[in-house]
């Protein structure tokens, strides 16, 4: 298709070397499309434009994206050709940043339904450069945390070295949905709830003599709860024997509950006490088994190709450690007679 | 520390119990406690174990009958012997495997 | 029952040399790697140098080095000092199953020259 008519915006990503972080791309359709496509800025009934150029599905994922090769060859579909790239709904997220991602993006509606949706497409030409200006050493992080029940605030970080005052209008959306209210280059949260929790993006327009373009920035924010002041429980192994059958395959299973911490390392190993001799065993990797807002729940096996004797003169000992303490819980096995 | 007693010269075909003495713990964590044997300008030889948690009872196979181990309180382990016979005459070590070992008894038997 | 097979004794080494010393079992150790090294001097119990095969037990110095796996293991010193001058016996540990639970090596003498 010819992409000579769409509309085209110019944006610029400054990723920092130091961290990862992610990137987006919204399918601004002009507005009279996007408002009866992607569901964003939807129109009141009282505001009917004097066509409705795009009567389009109303499903969200009904775009399509394309990648313009600076070589002119035809466009690319960005779902065949880019991995890291992944489209949400009306959205393109980058996973990874790099300048390899700088070119041209363009969306359109995948049904064309009427005469006007022809020239119903975005070009985004975007430009991704890594930051070099070490001038602001401690700039917002693409990932900011909130502490539920208290106050706080997300910084725009590409502008978060700038005091209020130098700062440009800043747009905000929150989930890909435009936070009307929010024009400075920080959001300030009375009272934190879990709802705060999401992906922010905050676009500001930068000029020179010849050119405008957007610079934007995704930031990350989970809502979280205090550091927990407690070490890890073991949730199982409960008894210290267990009853196991010789010559049969055995698994014994660890699971500890950790509590939450913003700098999270838990740690979750099986010794093996033999008399007055104690060492880790090779076991596979631990997995989480339950998440929530307060706590972590993590399991870690040992397994046995074959009770013999000589484990039944041996202790398995589960250890578990944050930043606060450890906790160990040993087993011991013993026959099952008749 | 480990400590034997009861080593003495005895004559053949008598009977004769050591006992080890733990200090500074207790067997409640469980512990292979075994009694080896030396003898004179020869290598060790185990005899038999007993794993403190729950009793269970190791002997070398030679040990077997002449030879029982015996965990008596949370601190001491015997071993009996019976039927004595000249090749048994050695020093009787006790150990808490792997790493604590008394400085052994002498058991010499010699008519 | 199982043997434990070690290099016949005595084994010579010079003082600042290199001395090495193997351990072979009829059968495969537990685990493959339950197998540890004790040094005893004249008249004293012996010492735990090494366990399961090659870590060092606390206080040995790095100069002992233990390798080897299922049936086939090595003590090797290095920098050899006159204090080694012992007998080193290695223990291997079995599933103990038919009276297989523990087998001593029968020792190799290392003479310091």
């Known amino acids: 298709f010819n992409i000579s008519g769409c509309s085209t915006k110019k944006l610029l990503w400054t990723y920092s070397t130091r961290s990862e972080e992610e990137f987006v791309l919204f399918c601004d359709l002009p507005e009279p499309q996007k408002s009866h496509f992607c569901h964003r800025n939807r129109l009141s009934p009282k505001q009917v434009p004097e066509h409705l150029p795009f009567m389009g599905s109303n499903d969200l994922s009904d775009v399509q994206w394309y990648q313009q090769p600076s070589n002119g060859d035809p466009l690319e579909d960005i779902r065949k050709s880019y991995p890291h790239i992944i489209q949400d709904k009306c959205t393109l997220h980058f996973l990874t940043p790099g300048v390899n991602n700088s070119g041209s993006y363009i969306c359109r509606p995948k049904m064309i339904k009427s005469p006007y949706d022809v020239a119903c497409c975005v070009k985004m030409i975007l430009e991704v450069k890594p930051q070099t200006n070490a001038s602001c050493e401690y700039s917002a992080s693409h990932k900011q945390d909130l502490l539920l029940g208290s106050t706080g605030s997300i910084s725009c970080p590409s502008l978060s070295c700038q005091s209020d005052a130098q700062s440009p209008a800043v747009t905000w959306y929150k989930n890909g949905k435009l936070l009307s209210v929010e024009r400075s280059n920080r959001i300030v949260v009375d009272e934190v709830y879990d709802y705060h929790q999401g992906t922010y993006v905050c676009d500001y327009t930068q000029s020179d003599t010849v050119s405008s373009w957007t610079v934007r920035a995704v930031v990350q924010v989970r809502t979280i709860v205090g550091d927990t002041k407690l070490k890890p429980d073991i949730l199982d192994p409960v008894e210290d024997t267990l009853e196991v059958e010789l010559g049969k395959p055995l698994t014994i299973s660890c699971k500890a509950r950790f509590g939450f911490e913003r700098v999270f390392n838990p740690v979750i190993k099986w010794y093996i006490k033999d008399s007055d001799l104690e060492w880790e065993v090779s076991v596979p990797e631990a997995k989480s088994i339950k998440s929530t807002l307060k706590d972590e729940i993590i399991e870690r096996n040992i397994i046995l190709e074959k009770v013999t004797q000589r484990d039944l003169r041996r202790k398995f000992v589960c250890f578990v450690q944050n930043s606060i303490g450890n906790t160990t819980q040993s087993v011991q096995l013993k026959e099952k007679r008749g | 520390s480990l400590e034997e007693s009861g080593g003495d010269l005895v004559k053949p075909g008598a009977s004769l119990t050591l006992t080890c003495t733990a200090s500074?713990?207790?067997?409640?964590?469980?512990?292979?406690m075994c009694w080896v044997r030396q003898a004179p300008g020869k290598g060790l030889e185990l005899i038999a174990c007993?794993?403190?948690?729950?009793?269970?009872t190791w002997y070398a196979s030679w040990a077997k009958g002449r030879f029982t181990i015996s965990k008596t309180s949370s601190t001491t382990v015997t071993l009996q012997m019976t039927s004595l016979t000249a090749a048994d005459t050695a020093t009787y070590f006790c150990?808490?495997?792997?790493?604590?070992w008394g400085p052994g008894t002498l058991v010499t038997v010699s008519s | 029952a199982q043997v434990l097979t070690q290099t016949p004794s005595p084994v010579s080494a010079a003082v600042g040399g290199t001395v090495s010393i193997s351990c072979q079992s009829s059968?495969?150790?537990?685990?493959?790697?339950?197998l540890s090294w004790y040094q005893q001097k004249a008249g004293q119990p012996p010492k735990l140098l090494i366990y399961?095969?090659?870590t060092l037990a606390s206080g040995v110095p790095s100069r002992f080095k233990g390798s080897g796996s299922g049936t086939q293991f090595t003590l090797t010193i290095s920098d050899v000092q006159c204090d080694d001058a012992a007998t080193y016996y290695c223990?291997?540990?079995?599933?103990?199953?038919?009276?297989?639970?523990?087998?001593f090596g029968g020792g190799t003498e290392v003479v310091v020259k």
């Open positions: 150990a808490r495997l792997y790493k604590l």
């Open positions: 500074g713990f207790d067997f409640s964590s469980g512990y292979d």
């Open positions: 007993i794993y403190t948690v729950n009793d269970n």
């Open positions: 059968q495969s150790v537990y685990g493959v790697n339950e």
């Open positions: 223990l291997g540990n079995y599933d103990c199953e038919s009276d297989d639970c523990y087998a």
């Open positions: 399961k095969a090659a």
